[in-house]
Interface confidence: medium
Amino acid sequence: SEVGNSQAVCAGTLNGLSVTGDAQHQYRTLHKMYNNCEIVMGNLEIVLIDHTQDLSFLQTIREVTGYILIAMNVFSTLPLRNLRVIRGTQFYEEKYALFVLLNYNPNATHALRQLGLNRLTEILAGGVYIEKNEQLCHVDTVEWRDIMRDPRLEPVVGDNGRACAPCHESCGGHCWGPGPEDCQQLTKTICAPQCNGRCFGRAPNECCHEECAGGCTGPLQTHCFACRHFNDSGACVPLCPQPLIYNKLTFQLEPNPDTKYQYGSVCVRSCPHNFVVDQSSCVRACPSNKMEVEKNGLKMCEPCAGLCPKACEGTGAGSHYQTVDSSNIDSFVNCTKILGNLDFLITGLEGDPWRNISALDPEKLNVFRTVREITGYLNIQSWPKHMHNFSVFSNLETIGGRSLYNRGFSLLIMKNDNVTSLGLRSLREVSAGRVYITENRRLCYLHTVQWAALSRRRADLDIRNNKPRGKCQQEGKVCDPLCSADGCWGPGPAQCLSCRHYSRRGVCVESCSFTQGETREFAEGTECFECHPECERVEGGITCNGSGADTCTRCAHYRDGPHCVERCPEGILGERGPIYKYPDSSRECRPCHENCTRGCTGPLLQDCLGDALPSARRAPTVI
């Protein structure tokens, strides 16, 4: 088999024509990166290499996932004689997968004379640019259209060597050099019309498997020169063995013990140590909506519940900044945890002419909606006049008090004349330090809060000179009737510390939608949760008794075992191949005949959709 089982992978570069150091340094870097490398994960960039250097170490390279750039070198030949595929996952100058430019020395005889890419039979994406290589021969004798997968692309080849020897007579006009060993192997333009990819001969039965790239030695997926998608232990496959397979006993997708991960174009049992698993791929770092976790010794990317954790430096003592202001507000975007403190001072909000800091745009305070924890203190001494609460901190759960303000305060709110309620609806703990809330002349509701539940000691509270409790009650600034006796942070059912009856997504409600309403719910404790979308709404009765698709009273579409499903399994990967089922008259999913390969409408062989397998061959699995 041409396709090997284990392959040495190395990282490519993304420097373009920029180089650092002299020619010797360039060579050493190149040698260090590509010695014994078979697959370049990225781009292969060879720039400004001298004619005296030995580049034979490049001959192990069989595949480049990005682009190849050969520019301003003066060696005579490129020893990439085993290169089979350029994948073109990245392009040079936006459209080229192979870019060869200015490989000659105008003041000497040294120059690139031959590309030597004799085994290159596939460029999966991107075009070819080979220009201004004064002595480079046999680039216009290559049938680039046979190599480039994209038929719309025109190769850009010109202004190269002029005094070139013809191809050897045995090559039929297509070659990489003058000798009989330099003939170009055509694997696409010579194929029979029946072949929808490449071929290993002209006959209709000499087509390569559709998963091959670059050609093949025979018809099987193990006969490929290289793989179009993924190489799984020598076989070219459209996908690596997936992390989940269908269990016919539990009617659920379960972890596949034989799962493999995509590492470039190779399926591997485990990712290299500096990579993490994202779904079924090895990646250098998790995407922005996921975070790295370790499960059973495996580093994986998991979707974050909401925003991914992000810790940011705060203000005040030990920080670069005395206060949140217009010069630093943008550094708090997407922060979930403040390491240290947050100070809101008049010099931050109104600006500080002495430090040449302009006034803060109050809208920007909304960046703090993502903050869930402050490890130090929260100190609010100035707040925009039109903002009547601190609802930008509505997701703040914990004030740690690891560093304290002034005489031991972890929460200090003073002299905010326009604030009428605190609005700290998620605050559940002030771990250490004292609470000081004074001289906020319009501030109500804070008398209702059971501070003892948040703070450690009653003596740690200094709450005075705010709007008198009696005045607040006269003005109707009291907790919503749906709040419990624990109090509230402000008006309405969303500001309660806890609920008298039930709560739905943080808002207190009289009751969950058990038997009526557009969306039906069940209760876990006093919290309302929606039934699974695959549950059918039961009029005047209970729709579900839990969150799963197996807790529905009735199914909205179909039932597969105990689970309500949108459609019956169609080609879902099982232990022994794809699984197909059909819905019976009572909308239960039933297995197709074992020889059906594309689904069915009933249990019999004649109910199969498309072609059924002949009786002897039984690849797909049905249950």
């Epitope: 005040g316 005395q322 206060t323 100070d343 001072l345 008049i346 010099t347 002495w354 100190n379 001494q381 100035s382 303000y405 002034n406 005489r407 200090l412 003073m414 002299k415 000081y436 004074t438 001289e439 200094d462």
Partner: nanobody, 125 residues
């Protein structure tokens, strides 16, 4: 920083009066409060009185309530401490202090970031 200069200290008989002044200059546009503290011989510095610069709210130590009065003149950036019915135990160096951002509660020494040099008040019996 705010620069502070005190004046008005001196020697006075018990039961007598003195008026201390403290003039602020420099970065006074963000003043929060100005206060008076004192430090008797061999004692810690202690709070005497303070006045909120924006609304004139006043705070006094229990030991001086009813005898001392703090006032301010915003136009002159000056704070005054009128001391009546002085007692020998009022003998101390009196310091003027200013609280600029970040502000703190008026009665706490930690809230003040600018201090005068101090003026000596001696009450003889």
């Amino acid at each position: 920083e705010v620069q502070l200069v005190e004046s008005g200290g001196g020697l006075v008989q018990a039961g007598g009066s003195l008026r201390l002044s403290c003039a602020a200059s420099g970065r006074t546009y963000y003043l929060n409060a100005m206060g008076w503290f004192r430090q008797g011989p061999g004692k810690d510095r202690e709070f005497v009185a303070a006045i909120d610069w924006s609304d004139g709210n006043k705070d006094y130590a229990d030991s001086v309530k009813g005898r001392f009065t703090i006032s301010r003149d915003n136009a002159k950036n000056t704070v005054y401490l009128q001391m009546n019915s002085l007692k020998p135990e009022d003998t101390a160096v009196y310091y003027c202090a200013a609280d600029t951002p970040p502000w703190g509660p008026m009665i706490y020494i930690e809230s003040y970031d600018s201090w005068g040099q101090g003026t000596q008040v001696t009450v003889s019996s």
